[in-house]
C-alpha cells in the first residue's frame, strides 16, 4: 500500500472528472478504542456451533493487500456433544467491502474502487425441510 501525499491545492468539485480522479490519503487512523478492540473476539471461530477457519487472502495489486477471510469448517453445525447435527447447517456470513485495485497498465499509484465479498464468520441455521405434498 502506498501513501499518496495530500495536495495543498484542493481539487475543484465542479470539475467533470472529480469523482473519477480523487486523491486519497491512505494513512489509516485506528478509530477503535483499545477497550473496544480488546473486546473483539478472536476465539469465536472455535467456540461457535458453526466454527470457521481464517485464511490470509493476499493480493499485492489491492489495497488493503491483506484481507483475512472466513470459511466454514463443516457443512453442518456442531452440537453440545461436539458431534455434527444433520438438522442444522453452517453458513458463511459475507460482507461486501470496498477495496482499491491497482490498474496494472497504469502507474503503480493508480487504483480503481472495486466491491469485494468477504466471509467474516459462520452462523448456524436450521436445514430447510421440504415436506412431500
Amino acid at each position: 500500500a502506498v501513501l499518496i501525499p495530500q495536495s495543498s491545492v484542493c481539487p475543484n468539485a465542479e470539475a467533470n472528472n472529480f469523482l473519477q480522479n480523487v486523491k486519497v490519503n491512505l494513512k489509516v487512523i485506528n478509530s477503535l478504542s483499545s477497550k473496544a478492540s480488546s473486546r473483539r473476539p478472536s476465539d469465536y471461530l472455535n467456540r461457535s456451533t458453526s466454527p470457521w477457519t481464517l485464511s490470509r487472502n493476499e493480493d499485492p495489486d489491492r489495497y488493503p493487500s491483506v484481507i483475512w477471510e472466513a470459511q466454514c469448517r463443516h457443512q453442518r453445525c456442531v452440537n453440545a456433544e461436539g458431534k455434527l447435527d444433520h438438522h442444522m447447517n453452517s453458513v458463511l456470513i459475507q460482507q461486501e467491502i470496498l477495496v482499491l485495485k491497482r490498474e496494472p497498465e497504469k502507474c503503480p499509484f493508480t487504483f480503481r474502487v472495486e466491491k469485494m465479498l468477504v466471509g467474516v464468520g459462520c452462523t448456524c441455521v436450521s436445514s430447510i425441510v421440504r415436506h412431500a405434498s
Epitope: A1, S37, R40, N46
Partner: antibody, heavy 119, light 107 residues
C-alpha cells in the same frame, strides 16, 4: 513506546518442542499482525508464519506448516511460536516482528530468542 | 517462492564513502521491498520501506530506489555507526523472503 519483549534462550534435545513468547506493549495488541522469522548462525532471515491476534487467523510458510504453531493470548498481549520435532538445523535466533497490514511493512522487532538444539 | 538475490555479500569501505547495495527479485515485486540494518547480537532495524521511503527517524544519508525486480540501497556518506549487515526483504507475497545480507566492514 512500542516494545516486543521475547522469552529467554532455550537449549533443547532433538525431537523435543520449544515455545517462544513475545510480549507486546505500547499499542493495541489486536490491531496488527505478528510474524515470526528465524536466523540460523551466520545465515539470512527465514519467514516462519503470521498470526493476527484480532481474529485468530494464522498462515504458515510451507516449510514450517507441519511443525510450527502460532498462538496469541489477548489477556496478556503475548504471541507464541511453538516448534516441534526439533532438529539441529533448527538452531537459530527466533524473532517476532509486528507487521503493519495496511501500510505493508515490518516496523518493530523483538530482541530475539536463541534456540539451541543439541544432543 | 520469490528469491531475493543480494550483492555484494560483503563490502569494505571507509568513513565518508558512498556505498551501494543491490537486490534482485526472481519476479516482479512492484515496490514492496524493505531494507534492514542488523548489528551483531541485535534484531533487524527498518531503514527503508516501499523501496524508497525512509522510515521514521532514519538519517537522510540512507536511501533506496527501484521497482519491479531491481532495487538499490545507498548510503551517501558512511558514518562509523553504519558498519553492520544490511538485508533486503520482499513483502509482495508470502512466504516473505529476505536477501542473504551484505556485511559492510571498515576498510
Amino acid at each position: 513506546e512500542v516494545q516486543l519483549v521475547q522469552s529467554g534462550a532455550e537449549v533443547k534435545k532433538p525431537g523435543a518442542s520449544v515455545k517462544v513468547s513475545c510480549k507486546a506493549s505500547g499499542y493495541t495488541f489486536t490491531d496488527y499482525e505478528f510474524h515470526w522469522v528465524r536466523q540460523a548462525p551466520g545465515q539470512g532471515l527465514e519467514w516462519i508464519g503470521v498470526i493476527h491476534p484480532g481474529n485468530g487467523g494464522t498462515a504458515y510458510n510451507q516449510n514450517f506448516r507441519d511443525r510450527a504453531t502460532l498462538t496469541a493470548d489477548k489477556s496478556t498481549s503475548t504471541a507464541y511460536m511453538e516448534l516441534s520435532s526439533l532438529r539441529s538445523e533448527d538452531t537459530a535466533v527466533y524473532y517476532c516482528t509486528r507487521f503493519l497490514t495496511y501500510e505493508g511493512y515490518f516496523d518493530y522487532w523483538g530482541q530475539g530468542t536463541l534456540v539451541t538444539v543439541s544432543s | 517462492d520469490i528469491q531475493m538475490t543480494q550483492s555484494p555479500s560483503s563490502l569494505s569501505a571507509s568513513v565518508g564513502d558512498r556505498v551501494t547495495i543491490t537486490c534482485k527479485a526472481s519476479q516482479s515485486v512492484s515496490i514492496d521491498v524493505g531494507w534492514f540494518q542488523q548489528k551483531p547480537g541485535k534484531s533487524p532495524k527498518l531503514l527503508i520501506y516501499h523501496a524508497s521511503n525512509r522510515y521514521t527517524g532514519v538519517p537522510s544519508r540512507f536511501s533506496g530506489s527501484g521497482s519491479g525486480t531491481d532495487f538499490t540501497f545507498t548510503i551517501s556518506s558512511l558514518q562509523p555507526e553504519d558498519f553492520a549487515t544490511y538485508f533486503c526483504q520482499q513483502d509482495y507475497s508470502s512466504p516473505y523472503t529476505f536477501g542473504q545480507g551484505t556485511k559492510l566492514e571498515i576498510k
